[in-house]
Interface confidence: low
Amino acid sequence: QRFAQAQQQLPLESLGWDVAELQLNHTGPQQDPRLYWQGGPALGRSFLHGPELDKGQLRIHRDGIYMVHIQVTLAICSSTTASRHHPTTLAVGICSPASRSISLLRLSFHQGCTIASQRLTPLARGDTLCTNLTGTLLPSRNTDETFFGVQWVRP
Amino acid sequence: QRFAQAQQQLPLESLGWDVAELQLNHTGPQQDPRLYWQGGPALGRSFLHGPELDKGQLRIHRDGIYMVHIQVTLAICSSTTASRHHPTTLAVGICSPASRSISLLRLSFHQGCTIASQRLTPLARGDTLCTNLTGTLLPSRNTDETFFGVQWVRP
Amino acid sequence: QRFAQAQQQLPLESLGWDVAELQLNHTGPQQDPRLYWQGGPALGRSFLHGPELDKGQLRIHRDGIYMVHIQVTLAICSSTTASRHHPTTLAVGICSPASRSISLLRLSFHQGCTIASQRLTPLARGDTLCTNLTGTLLPSRNTDETFFGVQWVRP
């Protein structure tokens, strides 16, 4: 079904255009597999236009279908390190509210030191996205190696 | 902050929609790690709508936040080859103007023969993007294995 | 060339916004390398807004440039398994109409168990996209590990 009658004019406001690109701030303490993110022009090329950060986790402000993308590179890593510390896994999911908790995207490093992927998914206002890195290897904080972002695509 | 008052009508022109998808033309001479790209309907499925090519490098014509994506596959490659020739690294960055030079996205091949990633980043009119492949392995020119593109997302 | 004179108003209808995100339904019979997809709210977080499924393959309904993305994870896989069963390759292409048949995106697994990539490509109404997985390993049907989607980007 079409979103509106042909020729209905589109207010700029309704375009949404919510978008965020974050860089790694730090990892959690021992029992907390979450990555903690930061964003803002003072930090370089990261930004938040619409979504917000809540204790390092990304919270959505506008309902819609989003493109979620992530790249995580392990620090001090070679293919030997990666395989020796296997399984190291990265999962992106909705962690709050608990009623909507679900894993959206999951990858293992196997013999590689970088994972990168993206997917389209419906998100609702108030959804908080968590990125869990399980395993003993450490993520690089270099802003061109580890980043996480979302882009509003359509209602 | 919202981009406009609700109900302000959006001229099609202002949507931007600048977009490009390029295929590999050739690699640089020995001391030049840059990949040289080409695009246009005569070449197949590559295209440039807004951005331009300047000596094989992609130049941005409209300020905004862009989704930058790339896939590079190494030619005549196996996991053994890839690990033996390690480190082979691909970096995408702004190389001109020099004052804005920065690495935007970086990946190593380790034991794999393909890297693929994407990220959101602010780009300005006149920014030229370079893709540097360091190492001794050569990239595949197959259009379904090696490609590079940008998509304007929002102002 | 610009898409319209400045200040031409944009009808919501023309935005397109066709989008789909699919989850794996099943693989084909022995001689059929295609992956068969499914989508819809009843299945979880997959959906089709515009494109349709035709016998498990994705058919495009609106001309334009699309961002095509895919992630496929092999089931019961380790880097040893992956390298032993090499080559395992994933290709996304237009398989119908036959006159437009072309491979759009291709990746090999080498020593990894997941591939993920994305690209911009022009697609036309009626184009059917097929995803071919060659090799003896089976894909995971977990919805956070294997998915395939398209997003209309511009006319």
Epitope: N25, H26, T27, G28, P29, Q30, I76, T136, L138, P139 | - | -
Partner: antibody
Framework: EVQLVQSGAEVKKPGESLKISCKGS????????IGWVRQMPGKGLEWMGI????????KYSPSFQGQVTISADKSISTAYLQWSSLKASDTAMYYC???????????????WGQGTLVTVSS | QSVLTQPPSASGTPGQRVTISCSGS????????VNWYQQLPGTAPKLLIY???QRPSGVPDRFSGSKSGTSASLAISGLRSEDEADYYC????????????FGTGTKLTVL
């Protein structure tokens, strides 16, 4: 069991050099940051700096930058704190502490050494 | 001179609830996670609370942490004589290149 064992107490004269150590056991030493914390007599805790033994990535507090050197030898799971020229004001208890955290996670140290008392007196 | 300010002393009787405050700024407590340490007389510090309010395993639930804006608090309920110790808050300070900063410390006396 995770343990950080520090070298014994030292009595030195001003101007002398000193290197104290902190040896880790019972865990993957190269997966942890090792921080050093000073406690002057009757005073509070002061963070000096931190090192990641795997690649010797080191961060110093601005107050201690240039005053001390932090190093590590991952082959023997040991971190070091050294002075090239001690002062009377360096008299303090020095603790090493480990942080599993991947990155400088705001003063989180889950295991501590027993402390090394350094006395500098003429 | 610490950038995190704590009261020099606090006291309470057994069974009581006491609270120790830690005041900072937007560059430290306001934008980072707060950890609390207990230092019993003559011993090394011990991690008591991390990440504003989380307790490591083995720490009794009598200890709780909270944070609001640029201040953090450590609460100890059901006070016991063995809680007599020095307590320090610690966090990261972004204005000091990400250095860790400790609070001035609070001496808790159980009367």
């Amino acid at each position: 069991e995770v343990q950080l064992v520090q070298s014994g107490a030292e009595v030195k004269k001003p101007g002398e050099s000193l290197k104290i150590s902190c040896k880790g056991s019972g865990y993957g030493f190269t997966s942890y940051w090792i921080g050093w914390v000073r406690q002057m007599p009757g005073k509070g805790l002061e963070w000096m700096g931190i090192i990641h033994p795997d690649d010797s990535d080191t961060k110093y507090s601005p107050s201690f930058q240039g005053q001390v050197t932090i190093s590590a030898d991952k082959s023997i799971s040991t971190a070091y704190l050294q002075w090239s020229s001690l002062k009377a004001s360096d008299t303090a208890m020095y603790y090493c502490a480990s942080s599993y955290l991947r990155g400088l996670w705001g003063g989180y140290f889950d295991y501590w050494g027993q402390g090394t008392l350094v006395t500098v007196s003429s | 001179q610490s950038v995190l300010t704590q009261p020099p002393s606090a006291s309470g009787t057994p069974g009581q609830r006491v609270t120790i405050s830690c005041s900072g700024s937007s560059s430290n407590i306001g934008s980072n996670y707060v950890n609390w340490y207990q230092q019993l007389p003559g011993t090394a510090p011990k991690l008591l609370i991390y990440g504003d309010y989380q307790r490591p395993s083995g720490v009794p639930d009598r200890f709780s942490g909270s944070k609001s804006g640029t201040s953090a608090s450590l609460a100890i309920s059901g006070l016991r004589s063995e809680d007599e110790a020095d307590y320090y808050c610690a966090t990261r300070d972004d204005s000091l290149s990400g250095s860790v900063v400790f609070g001035t410390g609070t001496k808790l006396t159980v009367l």
